[in-house]
Interface confidence: low
Amino acid sequence: GGQPSSTDAPKAWNYELPATNYETQDSHKAGPIGILFELVHIFLYVVQPRDFPEDTLRKFLQKAYESKIDYDKPETVILGLKIVYYEAGIILCCVLGLLFIILMPLVGYFFCMCRCCNKCGGEMHQRQKENGPFLRKCFAISLLVICIIISIGIFYGFVANHQVRTRIKRSRKLADSNFKDLRTLLNETPEQIKYILAQYNTTKDKAFTDLNSINSVLGGGILDRLRPNIIPVLDEIKSMATAIKETKEALENMNSTLKSLHQQSTQLSSSLTSVKTSLRSSLNDPLCLVHPSSETCNSIRLSLSQLNSNPELRQLPPVDAELDNVNNVLRTDLDGLVQQGYQSLNDIPDRVQRQTTTVVAGIKRVLNSIGSDIDNVTQRLPIQDILSAFSVYVNNTESYIHRNLPTLEEYDSYWWLGGLVICSLLTLIVIFYYLGLLCGVCGYDRHATPTTRGCVSNTGGVFLMVGVGLSFLFCWILMIIVVLTFVFGANVEKLICEPYTSKELFRVLDTPYLLNEDWEYYLSGKLFNKSKMKLTFEQVYSDCKKNRGTYGTLHLQNSFNISEHLNINEHTGSISSELESLKVNLNIFLLGAAGRKNLQDFAACGIDRMNYDSYLAQTGKSPAGVNLLSFAYDLEAKANSLPPGNLRNSLKRDAQTIKTIHQQRVLPIEQSLSTLYQSVKILQRTGNGLLERVTRILASLDFAQNFITNNTSSVIIEETKKYGRTIIGYFEHYLQWIEFSISEKVASCKPVATALDTAVDVFLCSYIIDPLNLFWFGIGKATVFLLPALIFAV
């Protein structure tokens, strides 16, 4: 099972019960010898291919529980026939074995008598038959092949015998490992319950953190919801406040520039008049009457009309009225009002903290009480009672096993010794056959007569006959052992080991009223005296294998319902009711009447009605009627064309004066005109659509104010609910986790399933039955093949 999920619990907030590590392996690996065991399983499948007889076994067990069995009853006869039908393969093998047991000593006895009377081979022929050598070769090869087959069987026998010894030695360690795991289960369970309780503090701390940070968690949530609707309006007003300041600066610059221009233009006009007077005076020089100087003087005289300043510069109107209006607007600190707006928003978290102190304390009280409730519930869990009873059972079983293990090991050594004797006996017979073949082949002389043949050849024949004699003597005894071990081993494999692995055995044991005629379900009757409660061996075993907790596996909810006792809804309900009393009142400031009037006054200040074009037209004109610098250079050139003297000198002086006027008078005017242009442009930009902008801002302000009036309370309610869901989510998630852990994880009964696997699958089937079956398979194979070996040897 996975973790329980809670909608509001943060995804990262997952609890995990510390894993319990068990020593005993889940499965037993046979290693390379497993191939031999598999070979025996295949043989058993051929002998006994039928499915596990669930019904037959049920009926058989029911009959076995009956005090007196009536063998004449038809159902008893049918049951007997069913058993015979299922066991047919094994019965057939037993019949063949019994025939072997009966016939081999008889045949041996008669053969011995016959041989003594020189009737059954052994007579000497002077002349060989034509096919004699060929037949001899065939017999020798056949005997060799059969001896190899017998050797393989003997090898299986030795391996099986060795396996029993080594595996039984391992059983003590295996038992200890299982008991250690069962003790771990018993010891870990109280620790797991303590751990579950300890997690409550973690959950509570998380909730307390959120409660202590209510300013940022709830207040911040409210703030984040309100900000997008309020901040943009405050931003627009702030930008308008900046625009008002910029307008004031531009108007001040413009006014001072206009005053400067008026003054500078007057000074330029005065300077030009003065230089014109000087030039006229110079041109009265007698030299101007003389040709070609007169042409030059006339040219200069004609150009004097160009030396004029632009009179319109002195006529540009000032902007005092507009500046006064803007200064009046600036009397209200719009920036400060906006700052107050921002401040009222940023104060939300602190206001939330101040207003929720009592509620937070109440929730904390409830959370502390939930902890002790959970403690009470876990103390009343029946897991501990079951484990206490189980502990007694574990102790008894352990002492029983430790008491009887030495006896088992003693019996094992007898088995091992017996097996060794059987395998050695077979080995002896087969060695005689091998020696007979070896001596016969090595000592054979084609030209020798029976009376003159060599010692080696003769010994070979003796060895073969000793092998035959031993075969007749012991093979029937070996076959008795084979038949007995086969019947036992094959049935245990087919009726216990295989159905245990496939869980069919559990299905038989789970048959209602089978193990106890008063109980429908044996386990529930045994554990709870509630035999109607469906608790099956198969389900319990499967759940334990899956590492499921005892509570869920044994359906303990029928005797103690953890969900009812934990009562998640009641706990979350008490938190909810505390949260319902959470009330937050906010006072968000947005500009106010003074701020609105301020914006409206600015819209009416007149900067949008100024005649900007008349100002811009003057900024494009030259301050004087002509480029004074060009005029000065031209005058200088003309003066230089005159002969040296007073006229030339005075004209050059005037040219220099004009250059100075350009430097000192014209350039500052041009600078002022540039400043005027920039100020006008700023005002034009600010004034453009000013009324519409202010109208739009006021509309946005109304919208924001409406939003605050109509939505703040719903935002607070929504965020409070969300906050509450988060707090409750922690506990819902925790309580669901407790329910899940106690049901699915605490006191995981895996060691019980592992112990059962160890007893049946590992100890009985892998340690005893598999080697036993391999033993009869190998020895049986060797014994059966003694018959053809014996024939070919003779």
């Epitope: 940022s216 405050l234 921002y342 401040q343 928003l345 602190d350």
Partner: antibody, heavy 120, light 110 residues
């Protein structure tokens, strides 16, 4: 224009208290904003220490909470930092800053003093 | 508590080169509250980029900022000599109430 100027001793003995003053010109500390102290350690790491709000309320870095106190004198437009039980770890350059909490700076520090180097 | 990690700690760039430095938060941060400061040796830090992407007054247009969630960056489209300085990212955190600074990225001329 707003200007901030830190002053105080450049050398303090371990276990003594460190006291610094921040004089603000061009703006009244009661009119708005948070007035904060930041320090920069020799490795250039910056650490916020705490602030005093325009309304006189405080907030401190949890790591300094038990040792720090930020107060003000509204008549002189000054902010004071007091750090108790100093150790060599408190050697740093201490800056006085203005925290602009509204839009558009959202808790950005738009004005900083030139800083005062303090060695413990 | 959120931690701001700036990378790289030191970087060098040629004049005219495009430069990007990053600031990674250990958990998600509101872009409103993420700012960048520039500090030249011997002087105090200056607010350089506010609220993730807005340039403070007087900051050349070659600077830009971007990011959201846990990853933020400052980019200089074409490096100039005067851009050599240390840049710090800074974040305001509501709970617990804190102002955090990154460790800084020192930008040098190659």
């Amino acid at each position: 224009d707003v200007q901030l100027q830190e002053s105080g001793p450049g050398l303090v003995k371990p276990s003594q208290s460190l006291s610094l003053t921040c004089s603000v010109t061009g703006y009244s500390i009661t009119s708005g904003y948070y007035w904060s102290w930041i320090r920069q350690f020799p490795g250039n790491k910056l650490e916020w220490m705490g602030y005093i709000s325009y309304d006189g309320s405080n907030n401190y870095n949890p790591s300094l909470k038990n040792r720090i106190s930020i107060t003000r004198d509204t008549s002189k437009n000054q902010i004071f930092l007091k750090l108790n039980s100093v150790t060599t770890e408190d050697t740093a350059t201490y800056y006085c800053t203005r925290v602009y909490f509204g839009h558009p700076y959202y808790y950005g520090m738009d004005y900083w003093g030139q800083g005062i180097s303090v060695t413990v | 508590q959120i931690v701001l990690t700036q990378s790289p700690a030191i970087m060098s760039a040629s004049l005219g080169e495009r430069v990007t430095m990053t600031c990674t938060a250990s958990s998600s941060v509101s872009s409103f509250y993420l700012h960048w400061y520039r500090q030249k040796p011997g002087s105090s830090p200056k607010l350089w980029i506010y609220s993730t992407s807005n340039l403070a007054s007087g900051v050349p247009a070659r600077f830009s900022g971007s990011g959201s969630g846990t990853s933020y960056s400052l980019t200089i489209s074409s490096m100039e000599a005067e851009d050599a300085a240390t840049y710090y990212c800074h974040q305001y955190h509501r709970s617990p109430y804190m102002y955090m600074f990154g460790g800084g990225t020192k930008l040098e001329i190659k």
